[in-house]
Structure formats: structure tokens, C-alpha cells
């Protein structure tokens, strides 16, 4: 069974998938469509790296540009380094500027909805 066929079988169960499952799925060549991606739990999507989302969505990653104002895409973009976002070739803006340090202050982030940054 190839990645696409596997994805069709598990698609209906993905809504509540934790981050670890999504990370594992990103290694399976599933090419998840954007509509399914946007139904995932925001807290499960946020920790994914640009490389992992790129692998998870495959060719559909191109659609992130059109959905950059919608959750969880918007929130995910804010968590990524701008350098990494640039590799997607979509002109996405709003990532963490180069040279900034991301502090994993869970309480701060829970309250503000954005990561805490220390300038260069």
C-alpha cells in the first residue's frame, strides 16, 4: 500500500491525531490535502517543523499561501523561522526573524497565543 492509499484509509481518524502521529505520518509520503490539514488540532500542528509540514502536505503545501490567515495555518506560520518559511517558495511572511531566540515559555504562550522572542 502506497502513502496515498494509506492516507485515504486513515483520513477520517486524523482529526484528533497528536503531534507524534503527524510527525510519523510526514515520513509516509501521504500528500495530505489542505482541507484535512486544517481540520487537525491546532496544538498538534504547532510543534511541526517546516520540513515536516512540507513532507506531510507534499504538493498541497503550495496552498498554505491561500490559507495563511486561517487557523491552524496562521498560528503555525508565527511559530516558524522566516528562513525556514522561505524554503517553501510561497512568499509566506510573519515568521520569526533571523537572529531571534525562541523561548519555550508555555504559560506566556498560552496567555498571548504567540511565542516569546528575545531579540538579537
Amino acid at each position: 500500500m502506497n502513502g496515498s492509499e494509506y492516507f485515504v484509509k486513515i483520513q477520517s481518524f486524523l482529526g484528533g491525531a497528536p503531534t507524534e502521529d503527524l510527525k510519523a505520518l510526514s515520513q509516509q509520503n501521504v500528500s495530505m490535502d489542505l482541507a484535512t490539514f486544517m481540520k487537525l488540532r491546532t496544538d498538534a500542528v504547532l510543534p511541526l517543523t517546516v520540513a515536516e509540514v512540507q513532507k506531510l502536505l507534499g504538493p498541497h503545501v503550495e496552498g498554505l499561501k491561500a490559507e495563511e490567515r486561517h487557523r491552524p495555518v496562521r498560528d503555525w506560520i508565527l511559530r516558524q523561522r522566516q528562513d525556514d518559511l522561505d524554503t517553501l517558495g510561497l512568499g509566506l511572511q510573519g515568521g520569526i526573524p533571523n537572529g531571534y531566540l525562541v523561548l519555550d515559555l508555555s504559560m506566556q504562550e498560552a496567555l498571548s497565543g504567540t511565542p516569546c522572542l528575545l531579540g538579537p
Epitope: A35, M38, H60, E62, L88, G89, G91
Partner: antibody
């Protein structure tokens, strides 16, 4: 203004390969993926695949996986599509088109495969 | 693969008339999270390359005349041309960009009487 420039025609013999070009101007080349589309008279439009000019990632329609190879040259803002083992079935107009919405298209290259 | 079916395959109308063409997809193109339908309409005039008219089923691209109206959701979509002009002579294609391979309808050829 946005422009995608393609050569008008290519004439090649069966069994040979050809590399079609698409020179982009008027926008940031690495901010939009490039798509390639085939059009044969009376057969509609077929999506061949796309390429991320930023990192060279490519994705193909399964039907064209062994036929087309997509590449880019960032320094010249040019996308390329190589077609191999050409037959008369490959005679068609080939378009490059910008981005997910295909909002700008090249004028197309008419490829004729004939001995 | 998602199959896109357009109808009619051709139609002939007089200048000033209203035209409606249909596009149906074999599965829903609606992203329920953003309420966007991943469907576009293109116009291809004789001897020219396709031109984007409408995206997300109903959003007109810049510079497209107001007489072109896209509508529909899910699997059923319509392109309406109010008061057809002579320059609207063209083939009209719908295309889904919900999932790869991205697929096009067979087209509707608009002829002017």
C-alpha cells in the same frame, strides 16, 4: 508586469528528448511555484507537475512521472521541463503557469514530434 | 483522481444574451475550515493561452469584467456571463486544485451567433 516567456515551437524526432524553457520576469521567482500543463487538440488540459523554485522540490502527475523532469535555474529565473523518449503522443502545446491558482500562463510551446 | 465534468460542450449565443455553463466535480472541493472551494475558471481565446477568470469558485481575478460571475459550492459550480460580448468567444475550462493530480474539465466552447 508578470511575464512567462516560452519559445513558440520545437520540432524533434521520435525517441529523442527535448528541454522546454519558461523564463519568468516581473515578480519574485522564488515566491511562486511553477506548473506545467499539456494541451492536445480536442483532448483538453492536463496537469503535468509543479516545482518549488526555492528548493527544487518537484511533484508529478503519476501519468507523466517517467516522461517529464522539472528543473529551475534561479540565477536566470527560468523553469525547464525535459521530455524524454518522445512519441507522436507527446506532440502538443506545453504551458508553464505560475502558482497554485495558475494566475499567469506562458504563451505555450508547440512541440511537434515527427520523423 | 477527481473527475471534472463540464456542460454543455458548446453553445452559441447572440451578443447581449446571458450564458450559463456548468462544472461538476466527482468529490467536494470545499475546505470547510476556510469555506473556500478550490475551483478555478479559465478563459482561452483562439490561439491564446488560458487566462484566470475566477478562483475559489466565486472570486474574480483582477481586471476581469463584472459580467463574469462564478458561483456554486461542494461539487456543483457555474460560470455565468451576463450580456455576452463578441470578445467572449473562447473556450472556458474549470479546474480543481483541491488535490493532485489537479484536473480540468473538458471545456465549454462559446460561439457567437
Amino acid at each position: 508586469q508578470v511575464q512567462l516567456q516560452q519559445p513558440g515551437t520545437e520540432l524533434v524526432t521520435p525517441g529523442a528528448s527535448v528541454k522546454l524553457s519558461c523564463k519568468a520576469s516581473g515578480y519574485s521567482f522564488t515566491s511562486y511555484w511553477m506548473h506545467w500543463v499539456k494541451q492536445r487538440p480536442g483532448q483538453g488540459l492536463e496537469w503535468i507537475g509543479n516545482i518549488n523554485p526555492s528548493n527544487g522540490d518537484t511533484f508529478y502527475n503519476e501519468k507523466f512521472k517517467n516522461k517529464a523532469t522539472l528543473t529551475v535555474d534561479k540565477s536566470s529565473s527560468t523553469a525547464y521541463m525535459q521530455l524524454s523518449s518522445l512519441t507522436s503522443e507527446d506532440s502538443a502545446v506545453y504551458y508553464c503557469a505560475r502558482g497554485w491558482l495558475r494566475d499567469y500562463w506562458g504563451q505555450g510551446t508547440t512541440l511537434t514530434v515527427s520523423s | 483522481d477527481i473527475v471534472m465534468t463540464q456542460s454543455p460542450s458548446s453553445l452559441a449565443v447572440s451578443v447581449g444574451q446571458k450564458v450559463t455553463m456548468s462544472c461538476k466535480s466527482s468529490q467536494s472541493l470545499l475546505n470547510s475550515s476556510s469555506q473556500k472551494n478550490y475551483l478555478a475558471w479559465y478563459q482561452q481565446k483562439p490561439g491564446q493561452s488560458p487566462k484566470l477568470l475566477v478562483y475559489f469558485a466565486s472570486t474574480k481575478d483582477s481586471g476581469v469584467p463584472d459580467r463574469f460571475i462564478g458561483s456554486g459550492s461542494g461539487t456543483d459550480f457555474t460560470l455565468t456571463i451576463n450580456s455576452v460580448q463578441a470578445e467572449d468567444l473562447a473556450d472556458y475550462f474549470c479546474q480543481q486544485h483541491y488535490t493532485t493530480p489537479y484536473t480540468f474539465g473538458g471545456g465549454t466552447k462559446l460561439e457567437i451567433k
